[in-house]
């Protein structure tokens, strides 16, 4: 799936147009520590701060940075080749809003890969930014071992063999 | 195959920390979750180890039990038991692929007594 | 967390008839829901998983539907084996971890007469 340059969700005055609330985007971790339901007001929040980034054709603008979605297949690190030799990085995860945000996006149902694999040497799950994952956030089913690597399909996210061939999402 | 241990009589406020032996299968591959029944009663899920090693917990059950694992175990502590812990303590293995959790293999459980 | 609502909490009926069981939960869990057999002073047995896939084994008598928040076990021609408590459980998680909570409905007896 390619997507045109901008946002697929239009925001007109802070709220969503033509945009249904996905139904499982959770809870929000608002500054104080006390939580909200996510909304599409949410969705299209800080989107005044967006205008200044400018995303290459084809793709895709949320909240100060840009996306491109692949309709190819590709093994893990192929994947990650293939968003390095572009200047970005397969997707981190940032926060709910930002995976609500993907969920969207995403049109099709079956795995693409995000920039998280399984390093033997920390034994944990590592963003491509070398940075642990939030196991108090995101939870990862299946295998946790060397060659796994973590693909989402819908609201899972799920640990797949590396040299396994899925879609992917760039990001910078 | 699966093997509670360590349920005993306990008085109240004493830790007491249950033991999941596994065999056949790596907790690295499998998650596994732990459940309780009390007398009489319905079962009563209490928490889950992942393949990584992170454990989540019902909400009743936070700060109430934590769970541990070694490369065979998955160990279940009670930190302040009260007579509500009174109950036969299970734990069970995930066998599902990632479309599902498929608790299909469970030990026979270990009674705790408190 | 979501609950789950597990109806009737007993139901007799005579051999070769059929009962139906039936599971609420509080929020939509998909098609994550398992099916549970259980015995006096044996563990559950898993009978269904995924709403409606039958565990290897599990005789065909034994049948799962539905999804979102409404589940119904049924168990056709039954037999004296059948007498038992049988039991829901909502194996529905998602990336974000405070939905990976596993309970279980408040159980069914069925006695079969």
């Known amino acids: 799936l390619l997507v045109s340059q901008g946002v697929l969700l239009k925001c007109q005055k802070g709220s969503c147009s033509n945009a249904t609330q996905y139904e499982d985007t959770g809870d929000l971790k608002v500054n104080n520590g006390t939580r909200r339901n996510i909304s599409n007001k949410d969705l299209c929040a800080s989107r005044s701060a967006d205008q200044t980034v400018l995303c290459q054709s084809e793709w895709l603008k949320y909240q100060g940075k840009c996306y491109w979605f692949s309709n190819e297949m590709k093994s893990w690190s192929d994947s990650y080749v293939y968003c390095l030799e572009r200047k970005s990085h397969l997707l981190i995860i940032h926060d709910q809003l930002e995976m609500a945000f993907i969920q969207k996006n995403l049109r099709q149902l079956n795995y693409v890969w995000i920039g998280l694999n399984f390093t033997s040497l920390k034994m944990t799950w590592t963003w491509v930014d070398g940075s642990p994952i939030d196991s108090k956030i995101f939870f990862i089913k299946g295998p946790a071992k060397e060659n796994s690597c973590a693909a989402i399909k819908e609201s899972k996210i799920f640990s797949e063999t590396c040299s396994s061939v899925f879609k992917w999402i760039c990001q910078y | 195959s699966l093997e509670e241990s360590g349920g005993r009589l306990v008085t109240p406020g004493t830790p007491l920390t249950l033991t999941c032996t596994v065999s056949g299968f790596s907790l690295s591959n499998n998650g596994m979750i732990w459940v309780r029944q009390a007398p009489g009663e319905g079962l009563e899920y209490i928490g889950i180890?992942?393949?990584?090693?992170s454990a989540y917990f019902a909400s009743w059950a936070k700060g109430r039990f934590t769970i541990s694992r070694t490369s065979t175990t998955v160990d279940l502590k009670i930190t302040s038991p009260t007579t509500e812990d009174t109950a036969t303590y299970f734990c069970?293995?995930?066998?599902?692929?990632?479309?599902?959790?498929?608790?299909?293999?469970w030990g026979q459980g270990t009674l705790v007594t408190v | 967390d979501v609950v789950m609502t597990q109806t009737p909490s007993s139901a007799s009926e005579p051999v070769g008839g059929t009962v139906t069981i039936k599971c609420q939960a509080s929020e939509s869990i998909s098609s994550d829901l398992a099916w549970y057999q259980q015995k006096p002073g044996q563990p559950p047995k898993l009978l269904i998983y995924g709403a409606s896939t039958l565990e290897s084994g599990v005789s065909s008598r034994f049948k799962g539907s539905g999804s979102g928040t409404e589940f119904t076990l049924t168990i056709s021609d039954l037999e004296c084996a059948d007498a038992a408590t049988y039991y829901c459980?909502?194996?529905?998680?998602?990336?974000?971890?405070?939905?990976?909570?596993?309970?279980f409905g408040g159980g069914t007896e069925v006695v079969v007469k």
């Open positions: 459980q909502s194996t529905y998680y998602s990336w974000y971890s405070s939905k990976c909570v596993f309970p």
């Open positions: 180890m992942n393949t990584d090693g």
């Open positions: 069970a293995r995930d066998a599902g692929s990632n479309d599902h959790f498929v608790f299909s293999l």
